[in-house]
């Protein structure tokens, strides 16, 4: 007990009344007003509770404190008086804060700040919406994926920030009068092939497809190694080059060098280069036959095989390349005497004559083209004087009936053996490769070396044998007339031709040798 008469056991937040009693401090309450035992407690009174008589007024909040309370302006409001806290409604000076004015960047990009009582909202620009997880942030609305399908089916929707476009799909274009972009855009397929908007390589032909196009190898061409056909990036090579390779089993550096040149030309070939490529091939052939190098060391039969292979391949390559030439007449000649004459025309109804130094060819234009082939008609003649180097002692195989006739009118083949090649070897070709049976014959007039008197002159062609070699033959070719240095031949097919002098001894005047010129 306190001598001054005050209880020393009063609980927390209370004060003594006398030596035996205590009372809770203001803002606290106990079960009874006067506390007489130390077991009782003083608890904080929540002045802000709903039944409380405290009223802070509008735009404010009541904050309970230990033993007391404070009135404060609600968020988004501030006191005009400047006092942060107050005790009752009469002291309340709270008014709305304009956050939009205080902080213009409150709504970040693409939104507009709108002040509200005690707060603000962000209003998004057209094409934007509030982000659910951050209601103050406007994000782009993807109209293309929102299920609105705002574009016509011929277009594709292109979302961009705050907007979208209806663009023609690749390979399509706006229909006449339609815009390209707005939501009323309507498109139609572009024919890239006829409009020239394609990227097809010149070795291919453009084919239009819905909304796109593809590039296919030209007829007679194949895709380059590893590149598929029918793609936009398809690149093709002329098959004629790929098949013209050295004959198997022939070992010659000179020939290998020639075919290396041919393959290089094939690799670099584009139809626009047809003229140059033809010239380069003939230049290479001219050089090969001017200087056959180690071909001279090959056995005779192999030399004939090489000649056969060169003649066959040259004809195919020239036929293929000449289809890409423009209309007109071409003449090329080379140092060693190789000569090419070519005429390219759209179908014409007349005969064509190709003239060269040592040979003239005459035939009907309508032989040149296969029916149904839309390309130009080509007639070509190549004179290859040097080919005779490889055809020395090449055999002549006569049809049995011609053999018999010769034995009747001549004493027989002299012991000297192989016939002599009098003329250049010439090769004739058409765009039409089906030339085994011409509807009207072709006529050749050869200039050649002098004929030894009393020797038989024959018009012959080179027949490519099954073994890849060949021989001279007369089937389908007849000698129309001959004199000392010229002979006229008529044939019902095309190939490589020449005039031979066979070692027959003519016994009496031979009607076949009579001049018909």
């Amino acid at each position: 007990q306190d001598s001054r008469g005050c209880a020393r056991w009063c609980p927390q937040d209370s004060s003594c009344v006398n030596a035996t009693a205590c009372r809770c401090n203001p803002g606290f309450s106990s079960f009874s007003e006067i506390i007489t035992t130390p077991m009782e407690t003083c608890d904080d009174i929540n002045e802000c509770a709903t039944l409380s008589k405290v009223s802070c007024g509008k735009f404010s909040d009541c904050w309970n404190t230990e033993g007391s309370y404070d009135c404060v302006c609600s968020p988004g409001y501030e006191p005009v008086s400047g006092a942060k806290t107050f005790k009752n409604e009469s002291e309340n000076t709270c008014q709305d804060v304009d956050e939009c004015q205080q902080n213009p960047r409150l709504c970040k990009s693409y939104g507009t700040c709108v002040n509200t009582l005690g707060s603000y909202t962000c209003q998004c620009l057209p094409g934007f919406k509030l982000k659910p997880e951050d209601p103050k942030l406007c994000t782009d609305v993807n109209e293309c994926t929102s299920g609105q399908n705002p574009c016509h089916s011929s277009t594709h929707c292109l979302n961009n920030v705050g907007s979208y476009q209806c663009r023609c799909r690749p390979g399509w274009q706006p229909i006449p009068g339609s815009p390209n972009g707005p939501n009323n855009t309507v498109c139609e397929d572009v024919d890239e092939c006829s409009s020239g908007q394609h990227q097809c390589d010149s070795s291919t032909v453009c084919f239009n497809t819905v909304g796109s196009y593809s590039c296919r190898c030209r007829p007679g061409w194949k895709p380059r190694h590893g590149i598929p056909n029918n793609q936009k990036d398809t690149v093709c090579e002329d098959m004629t080059f790929s098949t013209w390779t050295p004959p198997p089993g022939v070992h010659s550096q000179t020939l290998s060098r020639f075919f290396d040149k041919v393959q290089d030309l094939g690799r670099d070939y584009k139809p626009g280069l047809a003229n140059n490529t033809i010239q380069s091939i003939l230049q290479a052939l001219d050089e090969l036959l001017e200087a056959p190098g180690d071909l001279e060391t090959l056995p005779r039969l192999q030399q004939h095989c090489v000649a056969s292979h060169l003649l066959d391949g040259l004809e195919d390559v020239l036929r293929g390349l000449s289809k890409n030439l423009s209309n007109g007449l071409l003449n090329f000649s080379y140092p060693a005497g190789t000569e090419l004459s070519l005429e390219v025309q759209k179908q014409v109804d007349r005969s064509v004559t190709l003239r060269q130094n040592q040979a003239v060819m005459q035939l009907d234009w309508n032989q040149a083209q296969k029916s149904g082939d839309p390309g130009p008609s080509v007639v070509g003649l190549v004179s290859i004087p040097g080919m005779g180097k490889l055809l020395a002692e090449a055999p002549l195989v006569l049809e049995p009936e011609k053999q018999m006739l010769l034995h009747e009118t001549h004493q027989g083949l002299l012991q000297d053996g192989s016939p002599i090649l009098l003329s250049d070897v010439i090769s004739a070709f058409l765009s039409n490769n089906d030339t085994q049976n011409l509807s009207s014959p072709v006529t050749f007039t050869f200039s050649h070396r002098s004929v030894i008197p009393r020797q038989k002159v024959l018009c012959v062609f080179w027949e490519h044998g099954q073994n890849g070699c060949g021989h001279w033959a007369t089937t389908g070719c007849s000698t129309i007339g001959t004199r000392d240095t010229s002979t006229i031949c008529r044939c019902t097919h095309l190939s490589s031709f020449a005039v031979l002098m066979a070692h027959y001894d003519v016994q009496e005047e031979d009607p076949v040798l009579t001049v018909i010129t």
Partner: antibody, heavy 118, light 107 residues
Framework: QVQLQQSDAELVKPGASVKISCKVS????????IHWMRQRPEQGLEWIGY????????RYNEKFKGKASLTADKSSTTAYMQLSSLTSEDSAVYFC???????????WGTGTTVTVSS | DIQMTQASSYLSVSLGGRVTITCKAS??????LAWYQQKPGNAPRLLIS???NLETGFPSRFSGSGSGKDYTLSITSLQTEDVATYYC?????????FGGGTKLEIE
């Protein structure tokens, strides 16, 4: 008629160069190759090379590469041969010739004597 | 290179006699051979092409023959105007090569 007229004889010093000409007439200059031959005193003939006037295409005997250079002027129908770094070994008569239909020489020039002497 | 060998550098034959000049190639030249006649102080003149073809302007007493590697120029009934040097030339391969020449004299 077909003629190949060559330039006159030349006397040149060792190490010098000489250019001899061959004027063609009587045939189409661009249709045939023009060949050059050398004939040293009391010796045989050697083929030097040719020029094809149509496109200026040339071909040389390996032995004469670097020694002879062939050119042609279509407007004057003249073929030329320049010989460089001359030594006494190059003293010879030089002939130009027209190639026949095959690779023999059917018409020859008059010949130009080149003498290399100090 | 193909070597052309003319066995005789000189041949002395009596007037009206028969002459045979030979030419041998180091490889087959398949008749791609020419013969030339060169008179002193003149350019060579094409005499025979393709081993057997006599050029116009030469009399028929000149003839050529042969095959493979071996070739022959024959002159029957030799005349004084035939005194000259005769050369063979192969045109099968580049470089074109000539024989060393055969000088014909009258004994």
């Amino acid at each position: 008629q077909v003629q190949l007229q060559q330039s006159d004889a030349e006397l040149v010093k060792p190490g010098a160069s000489v250019k001899i000409s061959c004027k063609v007439s009587g045939f189409s200059f661009t249709d045939h190759t023009i060949h050059w031959m050398r004939q040293r005193p009391e010796q045989g003939l050697e083929w030097i090379g040719y020029i094809y006037p149509t496109d200026g295409n040339t071909r040389y005997n390996e032995k004469f590469k670097g020694k002879a250079s062939l050119t042609a002027d279509k407007s004057s129908t003249t073929a030329y041969m320049q010989l460089s770094s001359l030594t006494s070994e190059d003293s010879a008569v030089y002939f130009c010739a027209k190639r026949g239909y095959y690779w023999y020489f059917d018409v020859w020039g008059t010949g130009t004597t080149v003498t290399v002497s100090s | 290179d193909i070597q052309m060998t003319q066995a005789s550098s000189y041949l002395s034959v009596s007037l009206g006699g028969r002459v045979t000049i030979t030419c041998k190639a180091s490889d087959h030249i398949n008749n791609w051979l020419a013969w030339y006649q060169q008179k002193p102080g003149n350019a060579p003149r094409l005499l025979i092409s393709h081993a057997t073809n006599l050029e116009t302007g030469f009399p028929s007493r000149f003839s050529g023959s042969g095959s493979g590697k071996d070739y022959t120029l024959s002159i029957t009934s030799l005349q004084t105007e035939d005194v000259a040097t005769y050369y063979c030339q192969q045109y099968w391969n580049i470089p074109y090569t000539f024989g060393g020449g055969t000088k014909l004299e009258i004994e």
